[in-house]
């Protein structure tokens, strides 16, 4: 049971960061206009992943797309691919995990794939969220190098009256978004790995049986329990896992078939 | 057909308060900002303070900073300039102005404006 | 306070003749954020409220006659009348529209000559 529901409990927040992935790269406050120690000014400016957009004290909002795709910077084009490969690979986890878990049934497919089903999509979780916590600490380190290189020449002048006051932008809500949404990923993805350790067959004495020295007898034991033997080396309780093809009543894996609501 | 229409002007003594009225019509007052602006006889125009649709966000001039007090009521389609501890300094026409939408925050309709005279 | 700088303070053109006023700011009023200059022209007759002609620096407000165009960025701004009508006669000003407090110019007082 405990398996089941961790098994669950990680599609289920890898689903939520998955979701918050996917909305912190489609969100346009990654970066926002630092308000604190500045000017007050009657726009606000804030920029995303895909585009920039002004708001201005009229409420009117207006945002440009970033069309060039060879103008933009280097570290930009790095986070806009971290966040896609995190969003595919946690697609594609999702689609691999539905089918792992426990509680939903497709033909007679055994534990040990539907283990290795577990395994894989809580690594691609795993790698998902990883993806999406880099892509937004390399934005965010991005933004403070730029906002500390323009402190350093916040007014740049030509000489004289005239000023050019430097927007400084800080971090987004976007960036919040992000690194939880990559954490409840990873979270999730960790749990699909400890669901996969609980999932995966352990080997089980199927044909234990067991000889007494008197030969009246002859105690099965099925089910890998230990029979009382009467002598010899040989007849200590050696798991035996076989591999091969079950009935559909040997097939009662740690919670039972029943446990599926 | 906007139109925006300022009342309560007159003359107070300095130190004394007024409050002046700006009544609007023709447009969906609460979707726009507005900003008064004075000037005083002869001079020209000095912007005075801002209130944003909702009234979240009121700016004031430095000058009428601690002294004068914007407000709106969105359901009577009306806004309200308080002006406490009057100067003579403060003797002007007052307009109110709307905000543009899509005007880069320009003003876009002008009040006829309504005189306050401070004076002994 | 970004301080607006308009010259000249009175300016007398003939009719029918071209007249330009500049106005200068302290700080450069193009908004890094989208490109977009921050400028407002306003006319103001006697006796009479002002009248918004230009904002963003050169987008002419609805009703404005297409004699009238802005121009500039930064700092450096120009209102041009292309040729100019009685009707024309009035005081113009420019004012910041990015930064609080929204400054105006001093005024420019256009009459024919």
């Known amino acids: 049971m405990a398996v089941t529901a961790c098994q669950g409990l990680g599609f289920v927040v890898s689903l939520i960061g998955i979701a918050g992935i996917i909305a912190a790269t489609c969100m346009d406050q990654w970066s926002t206009q630092d308000l604190y120690n500045n000017p007050v000014t009657a726009v606000f400016n804030y920029q995303g992943l895909w585009r920039s957009c002004v708001r201005e004290s009229s409420g009117f909002t207006e945002c440009r797309g970033y069309f060039t795709l060879l103008g933009l910077p280097a570290m930009l084009q790095a986070v806009r691919a971290l966040m896609i490969v995190g969003i595919v690979l946690g697609a594609i986890g999702l689609l691999v995990s539905i089918f792992a878990l426990k509680c939903i049934r497709i033909g007679s497919m055994e534990d040990s794939a539907k283990a290795n089903m577990t395994l894989t999509s809580g690594i691609m979780f795993i790698v998902s969220g990883l993806c999406a916590i880099a892509g937004v600490s390399v934005f965010a380190n991005m933004l403070v190098t730029n906002f500390w290189m323009s402190t350093a020449n916040m007014y740049t002048g030509m000489g004289g009256m005239v000023q050019t006051v430097q927007t400084r932008y800080t971090f987004g809500a976007a960036l919040f978004v992000g690194w939880v949404a990559g954490g409840l990923t990873l979270i999730g993805g960790v749990m699909m790995c400890i669901a996969c350790r609980g999932l995966a067959p352990e080997e089980t004495n199927y044909k234990a049986v067991s000889y007494h020295a008197s030969g009246h007898s002859v105690a099965y034991k099925p089910g890998g329990f230990k029979a009382s033997t009467g002598f010899g080396s040989n007849t200590k309780n050696k798991k035996i896992y076989d591999g091969g093809a079950r009935t559909e009543d040997e097939v009662q894996s740690y919670p039972s078939k029943h446990d599926y609501v | 057909e906007v139109q925006l229409v300022e009342s309560g002007g007159g003359l107070v003594q300095p130190g004394g308060s007024l409050r002046l009225s700006c009544a609007a019509s023709?447009?969906?007052?609460?979707?726009?900002?507005i900003h008064w602006v004075r000037q005083a006889p002869g001079k020209g125009l000095e912007w005075v303070a801002y209130i944003s649709r909702g009234s979240s966000t009121i700016y004031y001039a430095d000058t009428v900073k601690g002294r004068f007090t914007m407000s709106r009521d969105n359901a009577k389609n009306s806004l309200y300039l308080q002006m406490t501890s009057l100067r003579a300094e403060d003797t002007a026409v007052y307009y109110c102005?709307?905000?543009?939408?899509?005007?880069?925050?320009?003003?876009?309709?002008w009040g006829q404006g309504t005189t306050v005279t401070v004076s002994s | 306070d970004i301080v607006m700088t308009q010259s000249p303070d009175s300016l007398a053109v003939s009719l029918g003749e071209r007249a330009t006023i500049s106005c200068k700011s302290s700080?450069?009023?193009?908004?890094?954020?989208?490109?977009?200059?921050?400028l407002a022209w306003y006319q103001q007759k006697p006796g009479q409220p002002p009248k918004l002609l230009i904002y963003g620096a050169s987008t002419r407000a609805s009703g404005v006659p297409d004699r009238f165009s802005g121009s500039g960025s930064g700092t450096d701004f120009t209102l041009t009348i292309s040729s100019l009508q009685a009707e024309d006669v009035a005081v113009y000003y420019c004012q910041n529209d990015l930064y609080y407090p929204l400054t105006f110019g001093q005024g420019t007082k256009l009459e024919i000559k």
């Open positions: 700080q450069s009023l193009l908004n890094s954020g989208n490109q977009k200059n921050y």
């Open positions: 023709g447009f969906t007052f609460s979707d726009y900002g």
């Open positions: 102005a709307r905000g543009g939408y899509d005007t880069r925050n320009a003003m876009d309709y």
